[in-house]
């Protein structure tokens, strides 16, 4: 059993010798050897080595103020074991009462301002030491402040202003923002961006889809966890090696930028929710034959952004070679049977309902215990709702009575 020592001595016991040396240099030593009760989130030696060299030099050149302040921002003036560190707590540090965000995740990981406790609960005579995997940088700024100051987020900033979201990111909270860089916006087809930015509802949905109402540090992410966004739909956050994935794609290029109301992860792709997509954009890989035909036969232009439609999209293998080699006029008539004049969600369909297509045909709905069918064809899973319509997936081509 290791002997119990005061907090200063305990830093040496746990191997946080750089933090111990800095505590000595900054005159913090006598405080943490003396009376009182402290919790010290002590960066490991490796954490100090990984700190930006300019920041580190700045601290070392001003030990009595900058370094002391930085070390105080890693401390609480009472003993708190990991069991006392409850998820969602904001604990005032010993530097200007700046908040320390505590996250205690279901997987057992405990983070302080997104720094992970890698060696916890080393009891001292006058407190406790928890070794953390990175140096906490001071966070006097909000997510809004960070966005306003970061040149590489100017596109996101402008989009957030346009959709009245920016101010919300300056308020108190525990947000997680997946912030697309300018490069991310450049990857979007210009037409998609021009349409969304001209539509208040779609642009607000787009912005809110990048925000979670909970604080998710990268250290907490294990498997593919699903989180609800402010937009209302969910995103899946996972990992692939050291990289964070969003909806299965590696896109986070800078993680865990901690602010006083949450955390920011910079991403190199814009996340587009279904609610901001045009109905034709909702189709997946299994409906490409249908969407290609809709485009080729001039029906895509009929799906105006300001109208509302429902696509009854047959899967690719519903289209036989015979169907695909039909006369184009006949094929166009068949496709028109798969586009409704109005937006009809899955939960709005009922047995005996009559639906009118853009070609003027009437289709009957049949609701069974285990299936929803329109005429001869039954639906598969995967219905979606977009900005100007809905899409339902069908096993076969629909043949009106």
């Amino acid at each position: 059993v290791l002997p119990i020592d005061h907090v200063y001595g305990t830093l040496g016991i746990v191997g946080a010798t750089t933090t111990q040396r800095y505590s000595d240099a900054s005159k913090l030593r006598e405080e943490i050897e003396g009376k009182g009760s402290f919790t010290y989130f002590a960066p490991s030696n490796e954490a100090w080595d990984n700190l930006d060299s300019d920041i580190r030099r700045g601290l070392e050149s001003n030990v009595n103020v900058e370094l002391l302040n930085a070390l105080h921002s890693h401390m609480i003036n009472k003993r708190m074991l990991t069991k006392d560190l409850k998820n969602g707590m904001i604990i005032p540090s010993m530097y200007n009462n700046l908040g320390l965000f505590i996250n205690h995740y279901p997987n057992g990981v405990v983070t302080v301002n997104c720094a992970r406790i890698i060696h916890g609960n080393q009891i001292a005579t006058n407190g406790v030491v928890h070794v953390i995997d990175r140096v906490l940088t001071q966070i006097g700024t909000s997510i809004q402040d960070f966005i306003e100051a970061e040149d590489d987020l100017s596109s996101f900033r402008a989009a957030a202003i346009t959709s009245d979201i920016l101010e919300a990111l300056g308020r108190d909270g525990h947000f997680t923002l997946f912030a697309p860089t300018n490069e991310a916006f450049e990857k979007l087809p210009r037409g998609v961006l021009e349409r969304i930015m001209g539509d208040k509802v779609a642009s607000e949905a787009l912005m809110k889809y990048h925000i979670l109402n909970t604080l998710q540090c990268s250290e907490s992410i294990m498997g593919g966890a699903v989180f609800e966004t402010l937009e209302g739909n969910t995103i899946e956050i996972g990992c692939d090696g050291d990289s964070i994935t969003v909806n299965g794609i590696k896109m986070v290029n800078k993680k865990d930028i901690v602010t006083n109301n949450g955390v920011i992860h910079l991403i190199d792709q814009v996340l587009i929710p279904d609610s901001a997509k045009q109905v034709i954009e909702l189709a997946g890989k299994q409906q490409t034959t249908f969407t290609d035909l809709v485009a080729q036969l001039g029906l895509a232009s009929a799906l105006r952004p300001d109208g509302e439609y429902t696509l009854l999209a047959p899967v690719n293998n519903a289209f036989s070679d015979d169907t695909l080699s039909m006369d184009q006029r006949l094929l166009k008539l068949i496709l028109q049977n798969h586009i409704l004049k109005v937006k009809v969600g899955l939960n709005e369909l009922y047995n005996g309902q009559i639906l009118e297509t853009i070609g003027g045909k009437q289709l009957r709905v049949f609701v069974y215990r285990t299936a929803v069918c329109i005429e001869n064809s039954c639906m598969e899973k995967g219905s979606k709702q977009g900005r100007n319509g809905a899409i339902h997936i069908f096993r076969e081509i629909i043949k009106p009575a």
């Epitope: 590489d152 402008a158 346009t162 490069e183 450049e186 037409g191 961006l193 349409r195 952004p305 300001d306």
Partner: antibody
Framework: QVQLVQSGAEVKKPGASVKVSCKAS????????ISWVRQAPGQGLEWMGW????????NYAQKLQGRVTMTTDTSTSTAYMELRSLRSDDTAVYYC???????????WGQGTLVTVSS | QSVLTQSSSASGTPGQTVTVSCSGS????????VNWYQQLPGTAPKLLIY???QRPSGVPDRFSGSKSGTSASLAISGLQSADEADYYC???????????FGSGTKVTVL
């Protein structure tokens, strides 16, 4: 403050090429794209295309595809637009404009007059 | 030949409100946002309104934009002599995959 300074006026013969430069200052060049817009004498504005200063990706107007090339030099924060096989109807003032897509063409260069005449 | 149609001129006396209109189709204004540019005589254009109704910082609130269907309009209230300029509307055209401008409207302060 943000500034886009373009190269001086040019007089070219039909069939020749012209290369106009646009030097940016006052902002992080690679964080924004550049669009090129031209204006024939007494006429309206015509968008020619866009280039990403971050990775050099381009998007040209269909009408000019094959005749126009846009490039950037990040070391000098300069964008270039080259137009080949010049015709008399290419006589215009050529403008570069900072283009972050979300806010299109928020700062403009002073313009470069290109005259195509035999 | 511009894809977006603007009236060639508009005028008003100081203090009045002048409205500049811009008409397009379902593939440009009908599908996408509208931006407005002001070009003072002998100078480069300047962004006035983006995303239908957003003013960049530095643009007075006397300038306002709106869009409805396949048309858009720019209103200039409290008209000043400094507002004498050409005004261009612009939008992305999905069918041409290009950014299109209106023919321009010359605003004169009487």
């Amino acid at each position: 403050q943000v500034q886009l300074v373009q190269s001086g006026a040019e007089v070219k013969k039909p069939g020749a090429s012209v290369k106009v430069s646009c030097k940016a200052s006052g902002y992080t060049f690679t964080s924004y794209g550049i669009s090129w817009v031209r204006q024939a004498p007494g006429q309206g504005l015509e968008w020619m295309g866009w280039i990403s200063a971050y990775n050099g990706n381009t998007n040209y107007a269909q009408k000019l595809q094959g005749r126009v090339t846009m490039t950037t030099d990040t070391s000098t924060s300069t964008a270039y637009m080259e137009l080949r096989s010049l015709r008399s109807d290419d006589t215009a003032v050529y403008y570069c404009a900072r283009d972050m897509l979300v806010v299109p063409f928020d700062y403009w260069g002073q313009g470069t007059l290109v005259t195509v005449s035999s | 030949q511009s894809v977006l149609t603007q009236s060639s001129s508009a005028s008003g006396t100081p203090g009045q409100t002048v409205t500049v209109s811009c008409s397009g189709s379902s593939s440009d204004i009908g599908s996408n946002r509208v931006n407005w540019y002001q070009q003072l005589p002998g100078t480069a254009p300047k962004l006035l309104i983006y995303s239908n109704d957003q003013r960049p910082s530095g643009v007075p609130d006397r300038f306002s934009g709106s869009k409805s269907g396949t048309s858009a309009s720019l209103a200039i209230s409290g008209l000043q002599s400094a507002d004498e300029a050409d005004y261009y509307c612009a939008a992305w055209d999905d069918s041409l995959s290009t950014y299109v401008f209106g023919s321009g409207t010359k605003v004169t302060v009487l």
